[in-house]
């Protein structure tokens, strides 16, 4: 049913869903801090623009009695329960921030007449693509897929002269929420990635993965997995790896690779790490002081969600337009706004664009070095290191199929 919105007469409210089931195991207090820091910035920006209005957030907490797994597995109904709670209390704001789980976002979008914008820090899955009033502020699976297909096809770089058309995907079911949906997208038979590859097999057991590393009859030299270096080590250990194996480790929300004192362990030498370009340092901000590097992106997405709302509110108020309209609900896309850590660009479907960075381990320095970057907004590759000190023969990435001739 249509819920009246606290969104007029100079008072604008943001409904923040504080769900027990979350894409990242982040204390809700940290997310509250991020939201409150965002509110302070928004109020300042509106005041500087001469807009004398009130902006507040209402935090809606789940009772946690039924949905208590803490991860996203039991999140499907939690979002709807919270919406029902909002509806009963007549406390809907101008915008809904949350949920972060793909299951709950999909279900909420499906089961409600959304005449208000929904901003999510997460909702990584393909099922949340192309939703007209949904904005996602963390890189969704679709963006990852487009990078991988682009990189697989590339054969005109001095360090990658073979097009690839095959891959193994390691997916054992214990992944974090982001990894689960990234790998799910690669596994899906109808996805762009599957469509563009000639051969793709999902490895579900540790032993399957371990066997492939030295299997002379393997069908691909390339293995995609998702997680951090420690995750890889648990799986791979110090096992020998054939010289033409390439492991692509997707670890988007981890900026530890860029820290000055980090040395790459030896088991990372056959690995290319795909991560996001680190923003300016968030270490001094009050909301991120207690966060691990992997959690910063999540809290930052909540904060940027507030700043995005402030950006849109400012535009609509300056143009004298109504906030409680479908036009406002559909406006949170195809734009760039000033985020906490610099400009944030949203694509035509409201999904955040970013610079992905592909790293390799230098055999000379044992440091992670940038091989190339990829701008998801224009789907363009920017080579960085034209003569990388690879572990692979001739400082070139190998062919994806052993024994296949030059291309």
């Amino acid at each position: 049913s249509q819920v009246s919105q606290n969104c007029h007469n100079g008072s604008y409210e943001i409904s923040v869903l504080m769900m027990g089931n979350s894409a990242f195991a982040e204390p809700l207090k940290n997310l509250e801090d991020a939201v409150n820091e965002g509110l302070e910035i928004v109020r300042g920006r509106l005041q500087n623009a001469g807009l004398n209005v009130t902006v507040n957030a209402t935090f809606m907490y789940s009772d946690g009695l039924i949905h208590n797994s803490g991860d996203c597995r039991s999140s499907t109904c939690e979002g709807l329960d919270l919406l029902r709670k909002i509806s009963n209390a007549q406390r809907m704001g101008c915008v809904l921030i949350g949920p972060s789980c793909t299951y709950s976002t999909f279900q909420m979008y499906l089961d409600t007449e959304l005449s208000y914008p929904m901003i999510s820090a997460g909702s990584f899955g393909l099922s949340c693509d192309y939703k007209e009033t949904l904005t996602r502020l963390m890189s969704p699976a679709r963006k990852l897929m487009y990078f991988l297909v682009n990189f697989w096809k590339t054969n005109d770089l001095p360090f990658k002269t073979y097009s690839w058309s095959t891959s193994y995907v390691y997916k054992n079911g214990t992944e974090t929420e982001d990894c689960f949906w990234y790998l799910n997208a690669l596994e899906a038979s109808v996805s762009y990635f599957s469509h563009e590859l000639g051969f793709k097999v999902v490895l579900r057991q540790d032993k399957e993965f371990q066997d492939i590393l030295m299997d002379h009859n393997r069908k691909s030299n390339v293995i995609i997995m998702c997680g951090g270096p420690e995750f890889l080590y648990k799986l791979k250990g110090d096992r020998a790896v054939a010289e033409d194996i390439v492991i692509i480790l997707v670890d988007l929300f981890n900026d530890q690779y860029f820290e000055d004192n980090v040395t790459a362990p030896d088991y990372m030498k056959n690995v290319l790490v795909l991560t996001l370009s680190p923003g300016n340092s968030l270490l001094n901000s009050s909301f991120s002081r207690n966060l691990s590097p992997t959690k910063r992106d999540f809290a930052l997405a909540y904060l940027n969600g507030i700043l995005l709302f402030g950006h849109m509110l400012k535009i609509f108020l300056e143009n004298g337009e109504n906030i409680t309209t479908p036009k406002f609900a559909h406006a949170f896309r195809n734009l760039t706004f000033e985020g906490y850590d610099g400009p944030v660009t949203l694509d035509d479907w409201g999904d955040v664009d970013s610079t992905m960075v592909l790293l390799y381990t230098s055999v000379d320095t044992k440091k992670y070095k940038v091989l190339l970057t990829y701008d998801t907004h224009v789907n363009k590759t920017y080579p960085v290191d034209m003569s990388p000190t690879f572990t692979w023969k001739n400082s070139k990435l190998p062919n994806d199929i052993t024994g296949r001739g030059p291309q």
């Epitope: 770089l157 940038v370 920017y382 080579p383 034209m386």
Partner: antibody, heavy 118, light 106 residues
Amino acid sequence: EFQLQQSGPELVKPGASVKISCKASGYSFTDHNMNWVKQSNGKSLEWIGVMNPKFGTINYNQKFKDKATLTVDQSSSTAYMQLNSLTSEDSAVYYCVRDDYPNYFDYWGQGTTLTVSS
Amino acid sequence: QIVLTQSPAIMSASPGEKVTISCSASSSVNYMYWYQQKPGSSPKSWIYRTSNLASGVSARFSGSGSGTSYSLTISSMEAEDAATYYCQQYHDYPPTFGGGTKLEIK
């Protein structure tokens, strides 16, 4: 319209050093690698090296490793190449060249003429 | 490093004539790149990835080839096409250029 504006001609004595500048405008300087290319009088082109302004990554042609030093100043969108221990063999026109992958060497500066003579 | 050999070193063509410049690589490359240079000017990107024309280049020009053998073709020579053309590879590091082909108008 983007531009690569190189510093003017140089006449230097053997054994000296010289620093050539290349100021970029009209595009995002840090997004594109900057190459340097040598063209000796009436001869072909030789690639010296490349630098990524954002990450500071430098790759040299082995032939020029002890001759050239590449640097950038992000704040002024300027790339520099220093050439040391100059001899008459280093007399040439030097170009800075932007990369716009997949179109390598897509835009060239106007060139800086270096003459090494006593 | 890969050596690129261009032929001929110098040639002349009449207006309207078809012109082909060849570039042979000492080992196989995936793509070839071509540059045009006129006296007193900087080189200009002309053809990239074997057959893609750079911005502003006339459709009279085309590029083709594979492996070790590549060529640049002008379907109908015009006076403004008189220049030196260089081929270049970036398949192997370091990138290398051919010796150039000087094309004159008759």
